[in-house]
Every structure is written in structure tokens, then in C-alpha cells.
Interface confidence: medium
Amino acid sequence: DTQEKEVRAMVGSDVELSCACPEGSRFDLNDVYVYWQTSESKTVVTYHIPQNSSLENVDSRYRNRALMSPAGMLRGDFSLRLFNVTPQDEQKFHCLVLSQSLGFQEVLSVEVTLHVAANFSVPVVSAPHSPSQDELTFTCTSINGYPRPNVYWINKTDNSLLDQALQNDTVFLNMRGLYDVVSVLRIARTPSVNIGCCIENVLLQQNLTVGSQTGNDIGERDKITENPVSTGEKNAATWS
């Protein structure tokens, strides 16, 4: 049976995708065939074939970026080290180990789902402007995050969420494969408005919040919290 695992990695970091037999296993590298490939597209990530040092069939996206340890393989550890993780690496990877002496029987089969994440920049909320006498518009921008974010606007007076019908979000996939988001909030003009923009990265369980107040050009201090929006700002660490 195929074992299933999940692992999380930050964009730009290195990650190990685990594929290993129980401790105490011993393998002969002249007997074992190891294949790492992506599950859906069958892209060849790397492989070990006895008496074949050439990796000519490795996809260009993974050449020199995906390695197994020969010393580890002797111990039954066929884990893949993937360097400089990119958003495009977010997929399922399959490790298949076959033994020639066992008639090319499958010895190990592991599927590892790689989830990729990147922190969004601290949101920037523009000073409100008035397209009409009875309306205020705020713009919130945050860039270079992954995966696709959720954007919430908050009434800072009572920490309630504003109606999402009042906001218009545009999410761009930038040149690096990361997400940029621009959210425009339109609300009725009131004498004093104290609102915040919150960018939620679900995978990192992270919220970045920045406030803006009418009558005060200087926004509140930026905040980051590991809690969902609805819990307010308990345990918030202040960014300087």
C-alpha cells in the first residue's frame, strides 16, 4: 500500500520529502531502483538506477535541485531533499522503490503532498479618499505571499468584520509565482472611522493586520497574529 504524508515548506527554503523503510533496513545500491516523480503529471524528479549515473531523464525544473543521499539509501532512507522551494513545487510527489532481486517487486511506495507557503508583506492601507460626498474608499495592498490570501476589513472599534460585499478584491499572480492582493473598501462616510485591513494566510495560520483611521493619517501599528480573525488580536506580536 502507498503511504501518504504531508509536509509544509516556505518559498526559497529547502525541504525533505520523507520516504524510508523501517530502521535497521539494509539495501544494496546495485539491487534497488528508486523513482521520485510528481503524481499527477508524472514529471521525473530524480531516480537511482543501478549502473546508471546519468540523470538525463530528470525534468529541467528539478535538475540539480532534487537529491537523494547514497549513504541514506544504503540504510533504506530514500528521502528527497528539494532545494529552493518554489510555488510550482506545490504538488504530490511519489517515491517508488523496487528490488531487482525480488523480481522488481515494490518494496516501498510513499506519496508526499508538499504544501508551499510564503509570508505576505505587511499590508499598506492608503489614506481614505472620497469619491463622493457620502462615501469613503480605502485601499489595502499586500504582496509576495502564498497561497492565495483571504482579505478581511475590520471595524477596529469593536473588532467586528465588515460585510464582504463592501470590498472588491483583486488577486494577481506575480512573476515569482506569488500572490499580490489589492482590496478596495467602499463605506458610507461617518464622522470617525477606525478600520483595519487583515490579510489571512490560511496555510501559515497567520493574519497580518494594519489599521487606518479617518482624521489620523498615521495608521495604527502593524500587527501579526497566529489566531483567526474572529478571535480578535489576542497574543498579537507588534511589528516595529
Epitope: T2, Y33, V44, I49, N57, L96, L98, Q100, F104, E106
Partner: nanobody
Framework: EVQLVESGGGLVQAGGSLRLSCAAS????????MDWYRQAPGKERELVAT???????NYADSVKGRFIVSRDNAKNILYLQMNSLKPDDTAVYYC????????????WGQGTQVTVSS
């Protein structure tokens, strides 16, 4: 897209020979472990022969010494030379690329019929 196309089957007398071919596309053929399977009427599909990218082979006991599996990595073709055929060898013969389907047999061609008459 993966394609495996078998050919070379036919009707042959017991004791005769046939050579089956399997043309593969859409796979990294030279690194794939390739198999020949067969399925006789009313029976389970069974593994007949296996060959690695480097040419290492493995055979079912029932065909050892009679069948020879080989491959041409330059042309992406898998072969099965069948000698001293017996009526028991009558079946539809299929090839399979092992790595592509996690060691399980999912990508089948249409197969090629081999009938051995006594």
C-alpha cells in the same frame, strides 16, 4: 499522453515462435521498468516477463527458458520473443510501463492476441 501499442500476435502451431513488440510513447522509456503481462480467457492477468532500463530481466517460471524479453531504448520499443510455444500460452498479451503508475498496472495498451493451436 502515455501510449503503449502492442503488435505481433497471431495464430501459431505448438512448438512455433512469435515476436511481440510494444511501442511506447509519452514516457521516459530508457529508465522505466517494462513488463509483459498476459490474460487467458476466464483467468487473471499474469506477469510474464520484466526488464529494467539497463536490461536486467525477470521471468515467470512458466516461461523461463522459452521467452526472451528485450528492449530498444533508442526506439522506445519493448520486445517479447516467444519460442517453443504451447497451447497454454494462448492469451492476450499486454505491455506495461512500471514507473509511470507507481508499480501498479494502469496504463494498458489494447493488447495483442496470441493463439497456439495443438
Amino acid at each position: 499522453e502515455v501510449q503503449l501499442v502492442e503488435s505481433g500476435g497471431g495464430l501459431v502451431q505448438a512448438g512455433g515462435s512469435l515476436r511481440l513488440s510494444c511501442a511506447a510513447s509519452g514516457i521516459a522509456f530508457s529508465i522505466d521498468i517494462m513488463d509483459w503481462y498476459r490474460q487467458a480467457p476466464g483467468k487473471e492477468r499474469e506477469l510474464v516477463a520484466t526488464i529494467s532500463g539497463g536490461g536486467s530481466t525477470n521471468y515467470a517460471d512458466s516461461v523461463k527458458g522459452r521467452f526472451i524479453v528485450s528492449r530498444d531504448n533508442a526506439k522506445n520499443i519493448l520486445y517479447l520473443q516467444m519460442n517453443s510455444l504451447k497451447p497454454d500460452d494462448t492469451a492476450v498479451y499486454y505491455c506495461n510501463a512500471r514507473r509511470l503508475i507507481y508499480g501498479r498496472t494502469v496504463y494498458w495498451g489494447q493488447g495483442t492476441q496470441v493463439t497456439v493451436s495443438s
